[in-house]
């Protein structure tokens, strides 16, 4: 009966972590002698390819520095305890401590048998590193020039994570790879890039990151900061101001970043009514006269710039009671 | 601890056979294999072949097949080299050796001469 | 059958020399290889397994290397109680072979 060695062909180990590479000598055959079993790495250089050893007198040997012995056991594998016992050799699984990126690679369990000879498998051992992951927006002003507004970063992956984004915006990325602190790894940057403006102030977009040891993508939602001018519209306005009315009010809506800091009032005509009162963002109106036939302008400050809106008012004679609806500047 | 001691020495005539014994001691005789190696006078070492007394398998080096018997008998832990049409050239010490990684545990050898 | 060729056959060397034996195999054998040293009236004893691996109690003088057809046993320091012939052996395939030995004599 043929025996064969059964080996995973692919382990993926943590780097820093434990890692087992089991090899099992089936079936087991009534008679079949194991004289050795040894681990090899044969793309190693020669004075490394012997990595470990398990004789059933003596027991295991790990010649080489890398991994070298304080780093690697057998799992399962033991010695004749005294000389009535026999060895048990068919589980040769080794368990590597402490992985480091020189650890990767081809490694041959092979069984010396007798009366069968020697039997082999390999199995190739990957290294990987959970990257650590982290997005932020980065405080931009309004420009006409793409700039970055927000950064995603996968800390020491290896291989390096994948990185895109999610977002309706009109954006690009712009993507770079440095070695990790630690050897072997790799840090990710994704950068999100677009003209900043207005509209994409406070917009949540969202960096994906992928990596094969996640179980699923990590999502790292991000806010969005963009510094501009004040944006403003006037509200208020119903197309039926009519000599004497009392009610009437002006609202001069902003949408900013930062806060506006100032609110002014003036019309273009240069004569400002007397029965118009400036109250921060509002305008209120005590009596509607034939000054009010003109276009008042609203104008807001914040730090970053000013903005304006226009209303026209036409001021009837008496009510209009077709029901006019509002309109805004 | 584990002994191999083996029969006392042998003349014997061509075309005759010869049957060398290897009592062990020290050990479970039916898990190993008892190996036999020669060594013919002033040249090196020949594996000859092997039994498993768990279960009486045996094994032999082609080159003596048909002329060689390797037997064991458990009630003894015993085992047994027979060499038959014996030729001058079986001249040699005869080792029973136990594999343990390598043959790590030997009989004291057992002078075989073959002469007219 | 697989052969192991030794060489030198006899090789006569001062004491605290280095000593190298060769093995080569005539097909590939892994790390499949033992060492053992024999001396006058005694069976064999294993100095390397596997090639590389130091048999216990075994002193550290003596190192084994190689793989795949060709090996090397090196002792090195030679001491007076090296006199011996020493043998490789493949375990790779069966049958089992050895090498036609190597005489280590003192000068």
């Known amino acids: 009966q043929d025996v064969r060695v059964q080996v995973l062909p692919e382990v993926r180990g943590q780097l820093g972590g434990t890692v087992e590479l089991p090899c099992h000598l089936l079936p087991p055959v009534p008679g079949l002698y194991i004289s050795l079993v040894t681990w090899q790495r044969p793309d190693a250089p020669a004075n490394h390819q012997n990595v470990a050893a398990f004789h059933p007198k003596m027991g295991p040997s790990f010649p080489s520095p890398k991994p070298g012995s304080e780093r690697l056991s057998f799992v399962s594998a033991k010695q004749s305890t005294g000389q009535d016992t026999e060895a048990e050799l068919q589980d040769a699984t080794l368990a590597l401590h402490g992985l480091t990126v020189e650890d990767e690679g081809n490694y041959t369990c092979e069984f010396a048998t007798f009366p069968k000879g020697s039997v082999r498998g390999m199995t190739w051992l990957r290294v990987i590193a959970k990257p650590k992951n982290q997005a932020e927006a980065q405080k931009v002003t309004f420009s006409q020039d793409p700039t970055t507004v927000a950064l995603c970063i996968s800390k020491e992956g290896r291989p390096p994570a994948r990185i895109s984004w999610l977002s309706s915006l009109d954006w690009e990325a712009k993507e770079t790879q440095v070695s990790g602190t630690l050897a072997g790894t790799v840090t990710v940057t994704s950068r999100f890039t677009l003209v900043p403006s207005g509209r994409a102030d406070g917009v949540t977009v969202t960096c994906k990151v992928e990596h094969e040891s996640f179980e699923e993508p990590a999502l790292i939602p991000v806010t969005l900061s963009v510094r501009y001018p004040p944006e403003v519209s006037i509200s208020g306005y119903d197309d039926n101001w009519y000599l004497g009315r009392t009610d009437a009010t002006l609202s001069c809506d902003v949408r900013s970043n930062p806060e506006p800091t100032g609110y002014d009032w003036s019309t273009t005509s240069g004569t400002f009514p007397t029965s118009a009162v400036a109250q921060g963002s509002q305008l209120v109106i005590h009596a509607v006269d034939s000054l009010f036939n003109t276009t008042f302008v609203c104008t807001v400050t914040n730090a970053v710039g000013m903005g304006r809106a226009e209303q026209v008012i036409f001021v009837r004679e008496t009510p209009n009671t077709a029901g006019a609806g509002a309109t805004g500047g | 601890q584990v002994q191999l001691v083996q029969s006392g020495a042998e003349v014997k005539k061509p075309g005759s056979s010869v049957k060398v014994s290897c009592k062990a001691s020290?050990?479970?005789?039916?898990?190993?294999?008892i190996h036999w190696v020669r060594q013919p006078p002033g040249k090196g070492l020949e594996w000859i072949g092997a039994?498993?007394?768990?279960?009486?398998?045996?094994n032999y080096n082609q080159k003596f097949q048909g002329r060689v018997t390797i037997t064991a008998v458990t009630s003894t832990s015993t085992a047994y080299m027979e060499l038959s049409s014996l030729r001058s050239e079986d001249t040699a010490v005869y080792y029973c050796?136990?594999?343990?990684?390598?043959?790590?545990?030997w009989g004291q050898g057992t002078t075989v001469t073959v002469s007219s | 059958d697989i052969q192991m060729t030794q060489s030198p056959s006899t090789l006569s060397a001062s004491v605290g020399d280095r000593v190298t034996i060769t093995c080569r195999a005539s097909?590939?054998?892994?790390?499949?290889v033992v060492w053992y040293q024999q001396k006058p009236g005694q069976p064999p004893k294993t100095l390397i397994y596997?090639?590389?691996y130091r048999y216990s109690g075994v002193p550290d003088r003596f190192s084994g290397s190689g793989s795949g057809t060709d090996f090397t046993l090196t002792i090195s320091s030679l001491q007076a109680e090296d006199v011996a012939v020493y043998y490789c052996?493949?375990?790779?395939?069966?049958?089992?072979?050895f090498g036609q030995g190597t005489k280590l004599e003192i000068k």
């Open positions: 050796t136990k594999l343990v990684g390598t043959f790590d545990y």
């Open positions: 020290g050990y479970i005789f039916t898990s190993y294999w």
């Open positions: 039994v498993y007394p768990g279960n009486s398998d045996s």
């Open positions: 097909q590939n054998v892994g790390i499949n």
């Open positions: 596997s090639a590389s």
């Open positions: 052996q493949q375990y790779n395939t069966n049958p089992f072979t």
